[in-house]
């Protein structure tokens, strides 16, 4: 029950996280005009990964897309790439985790397969979250660098007669959305990995085998078999006592998970 809850919660948290990463990637407010200690302007600038916008006091907002690839800063391209990789990995992770959910029955899928899928999706969520956090952090670092550079050159002029105020940009809402979303995806991924450990079928060390001897059936107790070594070992159990003559109906039944005699 706890495993199912952990897996389900991990899935939901990751889903929210990935939705947040997508939202952050699409948002225009990655950087917003710094209003602190600046002349109050009737025009407000903000920028995203895909376009820059200007909101006037008149209420009109004008957005212009970055219609160039080569002309864009390498850092911006890197941030775009990180966010897209995060989204793609997260989306694949979600798809895989849907089939891995314990509460969903798909054919005769083994628990071991579900465990593997849970682990795979968990790792994907972790990487997705890290990509988002990395992308947002790179952009934030870029902003901080540019902020202090523009502060140093804030007032430039011709012989000190005319002042040209340089627009400074600070953290936009998308950065915080991205950090939180990346964190949630990461947490969801960790939860999936934890759930995977509980889902993995622990093979019993001693397996019972029903053995039919001639004349009457004798059930041999597990003591008559060598213990398999190690977790999940494929070592075949060797029979060390062969009692009685075999008849045509003699059957050695290999135990299923629930077949303990």
């Amino acid at each position: 029950m706890a495993v199912t809850a952990c897996q389900g919660l991990g899935f939901v948290v990751s889903l929210i996280g990935i939705a947040g990463i997508i939202a952050a990637t699409c948002m225009d407010q990655w950087s917003t005009q710094d209003l602190y200690n600046n002349p109050v302007t009737a025009v407000f600038n903000y920028q995203g990964l895909w376009r820059s916008c200007v909101r006037e006091s008149s209420g009109f907002t004008e957005c212009r897309g970055y219609f160039t690839l080569l002309g864009l800063p390498a850092m911006l391209q890197a941030v775009r790439a990180l966010m897209i990789v995060g989204i793609v990995l997260g989306a694949i992770g979600l798809l895989v985790s849907i089939f891995a959910l314990k509460c969903i029955r798909i054919g005769s899928m083994e628990d071991s397969a579900k465990a593997n899928m849970t682990l795979t999706s968990g790792i994907m969520f972790i990487v997705s979250g890290l990509c988002a956090i990395a992308g947002v952090s790179v952009f934030a670092n870029m902003l901080v660098t540019n902020f202090w550079m523009s502060t140093a050159n804030m007032y430039t002029g011709m012989g000190g007669m005319v002042q040209t105020v340089q627009t400074r940009y600070t953290f936009g809402a998308a950065l915080f959305v991205g950090w939180v979303a990346g964190g949630l995806t990461l947490i969801g991924g960790v939860m999936m990995c934890i759930a995977c450990r509980g889902l993995a079928p622990e093979e019993t060390n001693y397996k019972a085998v029903s053995y039919h001897a001639s004349g009457h059936s004798v059930a041999y107790k597990p003591g008559g078999f060598k213990a398999s070594t190690g977790f999940g070992s494929n070592t075949k159990n060797k029979k060390i006592y062969d009692g009685g003559a075999r008849t045509e109906d003699e059957v050695q039944s290999y135990p299923s998970k629930h077949d303990y005699v």
Partner: antibody
Framework: QIQLVQSGSELKKPGASVKVSCKAS????????INWVRQAPGQGLEWMGW????????TYAEGFTGRFVLSWDTSVSTAYLQISSLKAEDTAVYFC???????????WGQGTLVTVSS | DIVMTQSPDSLAVSLGERATINCKSS????????????LAWYQQKPGQPPKLLIY???TRESGVPDRFSGSGSGTDFTLTISSLQAEDVAVYYC?????????FGGGTKVEIK
């Protein structure tokens, strides 16, 4: 078409109050800000402040805080400029103007002359 | 506050001649976000409210004759009347729409010589 119609001229005594109205028509009142501009006799234009009827935001120029109050009534698509404790130097023509795309004043009221005299 | 300085204070031009009015702002009116200059030009005739001629420094308002043109960027702007007509006699104001408080120039009176 877009129209801003202002109330008529006012003659007031010093210390009194006046309320100038600016009725908007031909557009959605709450979508655009209304600015107020003062023009003293024989002088230039002086921006007083503006209101955004959509958001309720008001901004005043430095010399127009305290005695000057900008308000509006959405139900009648009207903006108001109220001046209290009138002084002789408040004698001027007061214009209202719509703030439009490009932060431009594209439509103006005809102006209201407020005369303060004892 | 941003100071808008207009020159000359008055201008007498012959009919059909070119009239040029200058406007200088104490700070740049160029917005880096959209590369637009937030400067407008208004015409005011006696007893009338101002009328918008030009916005964004060079964009002509609809219905304004094409003899009116605006130019300039940053801090220096110009309004040009390519061929002065009798009906152009008025006071012309420049106004910055970038910083609060919004401010107007002192005005330039255009007369016929």
């Amino acid at each position: 078409q877009i129209q801003l119609v202002q109330s008529g001229s006012e003659l007031k005594k010093p210390g009194a109050s006046v309320k100038v109205s600016c009725k908007a028509s031909g557009y959605t009142f709450t979508n655009y800000g209304i600015n107020w501009v003062r023009q003293a006799p024989g002088q230039g234009l002086e921006w007083m402040g503006w209101i955004n009827p959509g958001t309720g935001e008001t901004t005043y120029a430095e010399g127009f805080t305290g005695r000057f109050v900008l308000s509006w009534d959405t139900s009648v698509s009207t903006a108001y400029l109220q001046i209290s404790s009138l002084k002789a130097e408040d004698t001027a023509v007061y214009f209202c103007a719509r703030l439009y795309y490009g932060n431009r004043f594209d439509s103006w009221g005809q102006g209201t002359l407020v005369t303060v005299s004892s | 506050d941003i100071v808008m300085t207009q020159s000359p204070d008055s201008l007498a031009v012959s009919l059909g001649e070119r009239a040029t009015i200058n406007c200088k702002s104490s700070q740049s009116l160029l917005n880096s976000g959209n590369q637009r200059n937030y400067l407008a030009w208004y015409q005011q005739k006696p007893g009338q409210p101002p009328k918008l001629l030009i916005y964004w420094a060079s964009t002509r308002e609809s219905g304004v004759p094409d003899r009116f043109s605006g130019s300039g960027s940053g801090t220096d702007f110009t309004l040009t009347i390519s061929s002065l007509q009798a009906e152009d006699v008025a006071v012309y104001y420049c106004q910055q729409a970038y910083y609060y408080p919004l401010t107007f120039g002192g005005g330039t009176k255009v007369e016929i010589k």
